[in-house]
């Protein structure tokens, strides 16, 4: 992923007992929040592995890169980063691994320059549909976000609400059409069983999409047609059995796409014939020579590119009178 990185060489660290300023008060120019390290030269603040339970109120106005990783934030309320004056320069915000289980509507409001957000490795049981759009209007003001990293945000099974986790995430991505400018979206390691059909059509600027290490079985109802700018599509380590003609044609039609398909349990029967033919001709798939069959048993570990139509048969379906129990 592309989490914010820092070129800072010298950080000033505040004393642990420094009292936090009230968010309504502008922080002193050189103030650094308690339990954080600050580098004005690098415009970077790091509050890392400090078990913070809330976002510091006295963040310096100069901050461009903010690391709040490895904390215990639990909830991001509306306006969690709203300050007077606003954090107008904040461009990269990393909240990964901070035990967030709830991100409320408008949590990232008043961050006009926020281009990169990483919420990975948080068990997000409750992600508001308006977490990124900030309002429940049918069309919101465009979000400045360009990169959104949401790897491994699936909560444990017993903490999930009575709704589809995929649906909850997609609702947040689509609300108010605020994320039309998004160019990188990472959704790896989230146990996704399916991809709701609307999601990609409304993210037309995507250049990089990572859906690796999920449990996707099929892409039959997913349309890639509008993703003219898509350059990388990571589908490694899913549960894909075959890609059908419609999907193959759409991927082939994207001018810059490179698709990664390693470690899927490909089923090498008669339904695989079109995909094998396509694989032999396409330059779209990276490492296509590594793709192997998982089923049926007799085909296990066979290389897809080495198969021909005679290899790809389906067991005949016997009429009921001839079937054995």
């Amino acid at each position: 992923s592309s989490s914010p990185t820092s070129s800072a060489s010298s950080f000033s660290s505040s004393a642990p007992f420094l009292a936090s300023a009230v968010s309504a008060q502008p922080p002193l120019p050189d103030q650094c929040p308690a339990l954080c390290e600050c580098s004005e030269a690098a415009r970077t603040v790091k509050c890392v592995n400090r078990n913070l339970t809330e976002v510091p109120t006295d963040l310096p106005a100069y901050v461009r890169n903010l690391f709040l990783t490895g904390n215990q934030l639990a909830v991001l309320p509306a306006g969690a980063f709203a300050r007077r004056p606003p954090l107008a320069e904040l461009a990269a915000l990393n909240l990964s691994g901070s035990r967030l289980d709830e991100v409320r509507a408008g949590a990232f409001e008043h961050l006009p320059s926020l281009r990169q957000l990483d919420l990975s490795h948080n068990p997000l049981a409750d992600l508001s549909p308006f977490a990124f759009s900030g309002s429940n209007a049918s069309v919101s003001a465009p979000s400045p976000l360009v990169e959104l990293i949401l790897n491994h945000i699936v909560p444990p099974e017993d903490e999930r609400q009575n709704r589809s986790f995929e649906g909850m995430v997609v609702a947040a991505l689509l609300a108010g059409r605020a994320l039309q400018g998004l160019r990188r979206l990472e959704l790896a390691s989230n146990h996704f069983l399916y991809l709701p059909r609307d999601v990609l059509a409304q993210l037309p600027s995507l250049r990089h999409l990572d859906l690796s290490n999920n449990s996707l079985v099929s892409l039959t109802y997913v349309s890639f047609r509008n993703l003219t700018h898509l350059e990388s599509l990571h589908l490694e380590d899913n549960a894909l059995k075959v890609l059908h003609n419609g999907t193959l044609a759409e991927l082939q039609g994207l001018p810059h796409i490179r698709v990664f398909l390693d470690n899927n349990p490909w089923v090498c029967d008669c339904h695989m014939a079109d995909m094998v033919t396509w694989l032999k001709e396409t330059e779209v798939v990276q490492g296509k020579d590594r793709l192997t069959c998982a089923y049926p048993e007799k085909m296990r570990n066979r290389v897809l590119l080495e198969l021909n139509s005679a290899d790809l048969d389906c067991d005949p379906i016997l009429p009921p009178s001839l079937q054995t129990s």
Epitope: R183, R184, E231, H256, R258, E283
Partner: antibody, heavy 116, light 113 residues
Amino acid sequence: SVEESGGGLVQPGGSLRLSCAASGFSLSSYWMSWVRQAPGKGLEWIGIIAGRGSTYYASWAKGRFTISRDNSKNTLYLQMNSLRAEDTAVYYCARVSSIYYTFNLWGQGTLVTVSS
Amino acid sequence: DIVMTQSPDSLAVSLGERATINCQSSQSVYSNNELSWYQQKPGQPPKLLIYYASTLASGVPDRFSGSGSGTDFTLTISSLQAEDVAVYYCQGSYYSGSGWYYAFGGGTKLEIK
């Protein structure tokens, strides 16, 4: 980093192939571009090759200039044909950011002189 | 063809004073903000200063800032330093159904008054 080579003196009507060797990153993972600068003049975009090999050119460069890439050698090429005196310039190769459409890494350039 | 017009062609500013360079494109850049600024010193390749219209590249001093959207953009140096003497170029990125196109402005030579 990227480093251009292959420049030199060539006669009008001649051809030349410039190379750009990349190190520290995989060329196939990035869009790469060629930009030139005539002596004492401004920058002029020539064309670009996308990660999967699609190419786009400035209208004046179409037909005479061709961008290609050899992933196994991690090298970018610019083939220039039917060269004219006005093609005399420093030729730069530049890497395009993976998210933004901006040139974030430049070589030092190689000088091409077209003269009889 | 797309034309990018920079103004002025040259500019002389006193040390510590503000310098402003404008860039106008004949068409809107991609997503209204795919506009970059570069600094070039004699004998060197261009150096990226600002991308996405207003985002400062890594290691670039805070006195540089960019603004604008669509077709009109501005580069500002809030307090000119001696090391800022250089030629500055804007560059736009464009997309149409037929593909990608990039264009540079003609450059602005910045000197000390």
